[in-house]
Interface confidence: medium
């Protein structure tokens, strides 16, 4: 697994414990909370970082409508149980044997239960929509600059083929960033936009999971765009299942 | 590569405590759990606990709790088990083993040798 | 807790053999089974984990399947460094819990 040779840390993931471990005295690192071992030339799974993140000690408008099956992620924080590839199990339980099914970011897609509850596969999550609002500036930013600066930060920072990136919307404060990847689309290496979108989200929160890389530094024709929100939906390939007490 | 080496043969006798020790080599101490499993002569394999290495908190089996302790040195890569109270169904061979932090890396891919634990008067 | 029981306790094989060793919880685990090789003398090896991941260096003969609570171990063609005892073993929920171990024997 790649790392940086030189200190022997993790660039895309400062939540491992790196050693020259591997075949030849190579740097090798591993996630916090899992021991597992990871790949430092691409982003970690999320399930990792949470998994990590539960470990460390505590401290009718062109914007685009989500529809009645997005799921928004409110339950916060969970120490998840991940496959040996590192992603979400489709079934997660607690301590005090309450399980529930997620999706492939790892998002409750189902009410509670108990033990006998079956998850029967892990639902792709395929499309993603971030919800930004930015500080107030001395005028809007020009849509095609905000586009494109976006789009390169998604490919340079955490290594997304463009293809996935299918929209910027700008109606200011408002910024909507719609990731789209199906099951068959996304190819062998390719970064999850799962994986991305987690990252970007932490990013924005000041909480960069990059290895000593400066916080996120987002300018659009050298204005600072600085986010003070930041909401998440996602989208599943089969619709989730609530009853309709949750719903109401 | 990767090694777990434990402390040698004891003879007890019941009523004293026994502790084991388990040097890791070859990994990170801190990137993995430690646990600890016994094996009476002609048994199978019973869990005792393990110990979260990067937090240092352990866990124990019901059925140990109260006369088990799971410890660890980082400085020196070194995890513990010590058993007081000891009795003749005690004796066993006590094994160290890697494993990961969470329920899906409780597999145990590195083994130590083994320590045999005769408890007798 | 939960109780893993494996099926046969022990076993009469020949080399060139496919065998298969079965292994049944008593509540769901997921896919959080281990499969272990014992010889006589010597600490237990891992060979499957998660029910059906390969650990590295096992040969492929070995094979894992099963999810909830019914797990298999199969080797597709017994080689004479096989035969030995093997353990099951769920890590799914603390306490962790073996099987009582399948003994397999040169016929």
């Known amino acids: 697994h790649t790392a940086a040779q030189d200190n022997c840390t993790c660039p895309t993931n400062k939540m491992t414990v790196c050693s020259p471990d591997g075949p030849g005295g190579r740097c090798q690192c591993r996630a916090l909370g899992s021991g597992v071992a990871v790949d430092c030339s691409t982003l970690t799974s999320k399930c990792l970082l949470l998994k990590a993140r539960m470990s460390a000690p505590k401290n009718a408008r062109t914007l685009v409508r989500p529809n009645e099956h997005a799921l928004v992620d409110n339950d916060g924080l969970y120490d998840p149980d991940c496959d040996p590839e590192g992603r979400f199990k489709a079934r997660q339980c607690n301590q005090t044997s309450v399980c529930w099914c997620v999706n492939s970011v790892g998002v409750r897609r189902t009410d509670k239960g108990d033990l006998s509850l079956r998850c029967d596969e892990l639902v792709r999550t395929h499309h993603i929509l971030i919800d930004l609002r930015h500080r107030p500036t001395a005028g809007a930013f020009n849509h095609s600059d905000l586009d494109a600066e976006l789009r390169r930060l998604f490919r340079e920072r955490y290594r997304l083929h463009p293809k996935f990136v299918a929209a910027v919307h700008y109606e200011q404060p408002t910024i909507q960033i719609e990731l789209r990847q199906n099951t068959s689309q996304k190819a062998a290496g390719d970064v999850d936009i799962g994986d991305a979108a987690y990252y970007f989200e932490r990013d924005v929160k000041g909480e960069s999971l990059f290895q000593g890389r400066g916080g996120l530094d987002l300018r659009v024709r050298g204005e600072p765009l600085q986010v003070e929100r930041t909401l998440i939906y996602y989208l599943d390939e089969i619709p989730p299942k609530f009853s309709m007490k949750r719903l109401t | 590569q990767v090694q777990l080496v434990q402390s040698g043969a004891e003879v007890k006798k019941p009523g004293a405590s026994v502790k084991v020790s388990c040097k890791a080599s070859g990994y990170t101490f801190t990137t993995a759990g430690m646990q600890w499993v016994r094996q009476a002569p002609g048994q199978g394999l019973e869990w005792m606990g393990w110990i979260n290495t990067h937090s240092g908190v352990p866990k124990y089996a019901e059925d140990f709790k109260g006369r088990v302790t799971i410890s660890a040195d980082t400085s020196t890569s070194t995890a513990y088990l010590q058993l007081s109270s000891l009795k003749s169904e005690d004796t066993a061979v006590y094994y160290c083993?890697?494993?990961?932090?969470?329920?899906?890396?409780?597999?145990?891919?590195?083994w130590g040798q083994g320590t045999l634990v005769t408890v007798s008067s | 807790d939960i109780q893993m029981t494996q099926s046969p306790s022990s076993l009469s094989a020949s080399v060139g053999d496919r065998v298969t060793i079965t292994c049944k919880a008593s509540?769901?685990?997921?896919?959080?089974v281990a499969w272990y090789q014992q010889k006589p003398g010597k600490a237990p090896k891992l060979l499957i984990y998660?029910?059906?991941y390969r650990y590295t260096g096992v040969p492929s003969r070995f094979s894992g399947s099963g999810s909830g609570t019914d797990f298999t171990l199969t080797i597709s063609s017994l080689q004479p460094e096989d035969f030995a005892v093997y353990y099951c073993?769920?890590?799914?929920?603390?306490?962790?819990?073996f099987g009582q171990g399948t003994k397999l024997e040169i016929k």
């Open positions: 998660s029910a059906s």
């Open positions: 509540q769901d685990v997921s896919t959080a």
């Open positions: 073993q769920q890590h799914y929920i603390t306490p962790l819990t």
């Open positions: 083993a890697r494993s990961g932090f969470g329920s899906s890396y409780w597999y145990f891919d590195v």
